[in-house]
Amino acid sequence: AWELTILHTNDVHSRLEQTSEDSSKCVNASRCMGGVARLFTKVQQIRRAEPNVLLLDAGDQYQGTIWFTVYKGAEVAHFMNALRYDAMALGNHEFDNGVEGLIEPLLKEAKFPILSANIKAKGPLASQISGLYLPYKVLPVGDEVVGIVGYTSKETPFLSNPGTNLVFEDEITALQPEVDKLKTLNVNKIIALGHSGFEMDKLIAQKVRGVDVVVGGHSNTFLYTGNPPSKEVPAGKYPFIVTSDDGRKVPVVQAYAFGKYLGYLKIEFDERGNVISSHGNPILLNSSIPEDPSIKADINKWRIKLDNYSTQELGKTIVYLDGSSQSCRFRECNMGNLICDAMINNNLRHTDEMFWNHVSMCILNGGGIRSPIDERNNGTITWENLAAVLPFGGTFDLVQLKGSTLKKAFEHSVHRYGQSTGEFLQVGGIHVVYDLSRKPGDRVVKLDVLCTKCRVPSYDPLKMDEVYKVILPNFLANGGDGFQMIKDELLRHDSGDQDINVVSTYISKMKVIYPAVEGRIKFSTGSH
């Protein structure tokens, strides 16, 4: 028998420095978690103690804090090189700055292989990107070799900016021939490493013949066996065992997100490469694990360039700004309300006495809200805090839509409610009531919108044939998160101001903020 230790991270989202327990900015260092300096300590400890160790990342290192805003991926390559990652799969967010924003800072600078079997380049890009990422890698570990096949969410064109010269194929269809090649090479221990979410991870384990282990990302899934060490509630045991169609037990793992945990999986293989046993758990990277001094010193050196972003106070909050995915992807969250209020405020244009304003409505995909802000840091809100909440460098745009399109959008918002997906809408100038007992596509039971052609704003039922102005992220205007109906049916689209700037201007103007959850989004069961 031969034992392999797989250390894995996913969805780190630019959390190079340690963070608070909810993965926002570290306030009380003694209670902070994660960060690359702490991760390195744990990785080195395991490398010293165990013979056959692989350190893998399942994508979405890009995007999430001021580090990415300023360094644009150079920080990812630098610190992943320092930690000596063995391989990485491309995530959807690796394309947020376009293909060039992936090639130059990361693909050309990483000292480790970067993988995806289901992304195929075409046209002029094919030769430019050739060899910079690979479908598979054979990694020598001790006296054995381990095959790693990569995959990336085929939804990436809807979630990011990969351009028109990359084709994202079905994961299973693309993976099988690459695994077959590895088998031909007599590589009999194969890990699928990728970024398509837990459901796809399980499907890959079930359907792709020859895959022994699946290391995933994208859905921020927390798996744990036993009593979990922090706030995250396990979605299942670690590893999650899937029985493949050919009768094998395939362990599937993921390690939550934001570098809070280091996935730790021990696999025992027989001489033919069959998995005999698998066990482990994510390791919580809390303050009991010291930060490595040399990596910490390097972080501090790189940090200098960020300080002018982070020191300036824009305003104060006297309430917790709940931007957690657990709230904003499931219900009304006060961070969503704050952002929508800022978006409307930024578009106040009193040009006609018939209208108190030309626009009253805002919609915002919950998945676009990437971090909370803790008020216990003296209430201070900085640009850096906002960059963690709104890290994508998008714009808040003005569109004109028919009521029928908006109705479709709100149905889409909850068509697969409960899976922590990003399309759940936060709102401003809208009151919506959902009945989740009804079938998808028929769950919106009340949709009232704030009038604009009125001296005293009030909520009136949405009219299907009326044309409304709506402020929304450019991501939604472009059909992101599956909102194809917006892209296809919008009647006018004017691009607006940078998202962080809109919110920072609003906070500066208000000085002190205290957004509430106030019943903009409600759930009910029964008749209306």
Epitope: P113, S130, L134, L139, V141, K181, T184, L185
Partner: antibody, heavy 119, light 107 residues
């Protein structure tokens, strides 16, 4: 573009050792295997072994185990092949090479280094 | 060790001819076969890998086929620059081995 440039020709006496270098450029050295192949005059090709500069692991053709040593210097993006206890039948052109996809054919080759073993 | 036996060892042909070189493996190697072209005093050049995949920049007149134990390299219309020695190689099992070569000469 990918380039592999090897050190110059060597003449060695039987029993001696030779160390051939292979300086790479145009790609990230630590991400690809370096393979070593030799070709005796007028003969076919013979695989010696590989090194993975990402973690310095090596694999040798049993025929060369104990005599060939493959190393890499990542700071110089250079691979080395040392062959000891040289005999006349080791007279050959020694090549380093790199693949496109792991193992699947040697896509990029050095220009070759002629090692002559003669008393 | 897996033996890779090429045939013919020598081949005389004219420009425009269709040329086929075969390679037999002493045991199955699936499709883990590469083909190389080598000219005197030069390093080998990769033509085909995975038995049938053309390497970047290789003209479409070169094609490879086969799996298991029998493989062929076909040059659909021989060009003056194609006169060289061709080698097959298996990379399925260690030690990786090459065929003895097929020299394609001008008739």
């Amino acid at each position: 573009q990918v380039q592999l440039v090897q050190s110059g020709a060597e003449v060695k006496k039987p029993g001696a050792s030779v160390k051939v270098s292979c300086k790479t450029s145009g790609y990230t050295f630590t991400r690809y295997y370096i393979y070593w192949v030799r070709q005796a005059p007028g003969q076919g090709l013979e695989w010696i072994g590989w090194i993975y500069p990402g973690n310095f692991n090596t694999k040798y053709n049993e025929k060369f185990k104990g005599r060939a040593t493959l190393t890499a210097d990542t700071s110089a993006s250079t691979a080395y092949m040392e062959l000891s206890s040289l005999r006349s039948e080791d007279t050959a052109v020694y090549y380093c090479a790199r693949d496109v996809y792991d193992y699947a054919g040697f896509a990029y080759w050095g220009q070759g280094t002629l090692v002559t073993v003669s008393s | 060790d897996i033996q890779m036996t090429q045939s013919p060892s020598f081949l005389s042909a004219s420009v425009g001819d269709r040329v086929t070189i075969t390679c037999k493996a002493s045991q199955g190697v699936a499709t883990a076969v590469a083909w190389y072209q080598q000219k005197p005093g030069k390093s080998p050049k990769l033509l085909i890998y995975w038995a049938s995949t053309r390497h970047t920049g290789v003209p479409s007149r070169f094609s490879g086929s086969g799996s298991g134990t029998e493989f062929t390299l076909t040059i659909s219309s021989l060009q003056p620059e194609d006169f060289a020695t061709y080698f097959c190689q298996q990379y399925s099992s260690y030690p990786w081995t090459f065929g003895q070569g097929t020299k394609v000469e001008i008739k």
